[in-house]
Interface confidence: low
Amino acid sequence: IWELKKDVYVVELDWYPDAPGEMVVLTCDTPEEDGITWTLDQSSEVLGSGKTLTIQVKEFGDAGQYTCHKGGEVLSHSLLLLHKKEDGIWSTDILKDQKEPKNKTFLRCEAKNYSGRFTCWWLTTISTDLTFSVKSSRGSSDPQGVTCGAATLSAERVRGDNKEYEYSVECQEDSACPAAEESLPIEVMVDAVHKLKYENYTSSFFIRDIIKPDPPKNLQLKPLKNSRQVEVSWEYPDTWSTPHSYFSLTFCVQVQGKSKREKKDRVFTDKTSATVICRKNASISVRAQDRYYSSSWSEWASVPCS
Amino acid sequence: RAVPGGSSPAWTQCQQLSQKLCTLAWSAHPLVGHMDLREEGDEETTNDVPHIQCGDGCDPQGLRDNSQFCLQRIHQGLIFYEKLLGSDIFTGEPSLLPDSPVGQLHASLLGLSQLLQPEGHHWETQQIPSLSPSQPWQRLLLRFKILRSLQAFVAVAARVFAHGAATLSP
């Protein structure tokens, strides 16, 4: 058993039929010595008396809010949560496996630049009685600070008959060094509590590997005289690291016909303009990627040829 | 050339070669995300590689103040990786494919390090750790780890030279 936060404890249980469970001793936080009784949750049934209560925790029915009283007055609370281990593996019932970029990916994170700021998100089908707490650090043995905000519900989607809820959190490395080569990964730890079930999820990454720039901005077309060619121009996204002479992007320009089956013409360039042939009913799209490190491409920015 | 005495390097040449290094490093090991190499308990093997750290003056301001600190750090790293790519980690079994970019990568590392340090000048170089894994599978894993680490190193070096070429060239 260990303390998650004040008056909240996690009991780690091997979860199999007829498992013996864990013996837990609760102590009432009071100078009183006698006349103390214990109850569980909203029930008024007395579970025991005395300053300590010994319980055998085997299942969720044994978890919950234990309260000690004296003469009708509440003295203290202890909330017991369960963390299940099945076949040596901690349960992952609360979050959905996003399966990208690989199986058992519960947390996904992205950064728009090298400032040390990143956003992580996760999915669940659970809509109520759910809380998350997020901690992060750079490295684990001698951790350097990363500050995370509160996890917040960011989207709700309908998937067939099921609803899916997306939560996200924004974190910022306290002393980020955008120009340095990272040697220690960022560690993100999410504590998830659903009713009386506790689970924890972790992710480890370098900022450079989760970079995904915003799409290029101010995408414009300028027809070239007496030609089907146009000059496409764009700018670096506002959120990209500066100076751009140091934090450079490379771009992919695509001409796409109305039909998905039509051949796509693609041009790669380090410049912020390109000359392409604009076909009727086609659209021109541009996306960006770090010039020197192959992390994710941005989403496309698009304009119609017309 | 970036001579230790403090004269300016051939920023544009360094920029072109470092950008080529980036391309080669990624073509040598393009499997981003397919193998999480940090899960393989590899602390002792890749902890010794020289990293371009915060105090090494490789940020835009540090380069403006005095680029020599940063160039020395990059030179150290280039020599280190050049030695690793020439060691039995890469030359031993399993043999690299004939068209593997590792040979070209090795030559380009040497080329850039020579651009930074002409004959007769000596910067202190970091001792290469004795990494000689006995099993071919260990060697393969170590190659991947070294290449992933090299990708990060050359990306920072390429930024430095791109910025230098744009803002510090005479």
């Epitope: 728009k112 400032s115 700021r117 809509s127 500050t147 995370c148 905000g149 509160a150 996890a151 917040t152 519900l153 960011s154 989207a155 709700e156 989607r157 309908v158 996200s168 959190v169 924004e170 910022q172 959120t239 | -």
Partner: antibody, heavy 120, light 110 residues
């Protein structure tokens, strides 16, 4: 107790500028997304702009894009809205509001508002 | 003007139950949570309900919100004179990537 106190409103001529401030107290300001929402006299609520906890990501309604700038100073627990090129249709009570968590929605606490009047 | 549609007014007598509707589209109410705000005369809006039907502490359970498809509603039972106010629905809009509000409903307690 969460408190948000706006200031900086007043009468300004079309084309003029104003800077609104919102002083926050009673919570860890740097952990929360913040928004500005306005309400024209006798009308409904219109979301104006939002900023993430660290100040990194900002977003604006189309009606104010390019003219208004949201910012924050986490060391001073203060949110700002710099309003330039003001128009008569910007006349409204401007509320600063806290996002529930690091996101910008839902808005769980609102200030009392500050009135901006754009008129010649 | 407003992405979400509300009736401009509603009324009821003390003790009665009244319902205020809010209609949107698949990009807002259809795919996101609905939030309701109460604005008493001359005051700032106050959060009444979020994530479709959760109430912040201090909001009486006479207020209950629900959602179905691209519509939502707020029901107030046991109407009291202090409930006289403007009520606004709001939701995140995936297309606009920002919150959108209804035009508000003025509730009068007769």
């Amino acid at each position: 107790e969460v408190q948000l106190l706006e200031s900086g409103g007043g009468l300004v001529q079309p084309g003029g500028s104003l800077r609104l401030s919102c002083a926050a107290s009673g919570f860890t300001f740097s952990n929360y997304g913040m928004s500005w929402v306005r309400q024209a006299p006798g009308k409904g609520l219109e979301w104006v702009s939002r900023i993430w906890p660290s100040g990194g990501y900002t977003k604006y309604a189309d009606s104010v894009k390019g003219r208004f700038t949201i910012s924050r100073d986490n060391s001073k627990n203060t949110l700002y809205l710099q309003m330039n090129s003001l128009r008569a249709e910007d006349t409204a009570v401007y509320y600063c509001a806290r996002g529930k968590g690091s996101g910008s929605f839902p808005l769980d606490y609102w200030g009392q508002g500050t009135l901006v009047t754009v008129s010649s | 003007q407003y992405e979400l549609t509300q009736p401009p007014s509603a009324s009821g007598t003390p003790g009665q139950r009244v319902t205020i509707s809010c209609s949107g589209s698949s990009s807002n109410i259809g795919s996101n949570f609905v939030t309701w705000y109460q604005q008493l005369p001359g005051t700032a809006p106050k959060l009444l309900s979020y994530t479709n039907n959760q109430r912040p502490s201090g909001v009486p359970d006479r207020f209950s919100a629900s959602k179905s498809g691209t519509s939502a509603s707020l029901a107030i039972s046991g109407l009291q004179s202090e409930d006289e106010a403007d009520y606004y629905c709001a939701a995140w809009d995936d297309n606009l990537n920002c919150p959108v509000f209804g035009g508000g409903t003025k509730l009068t307690v007769l």
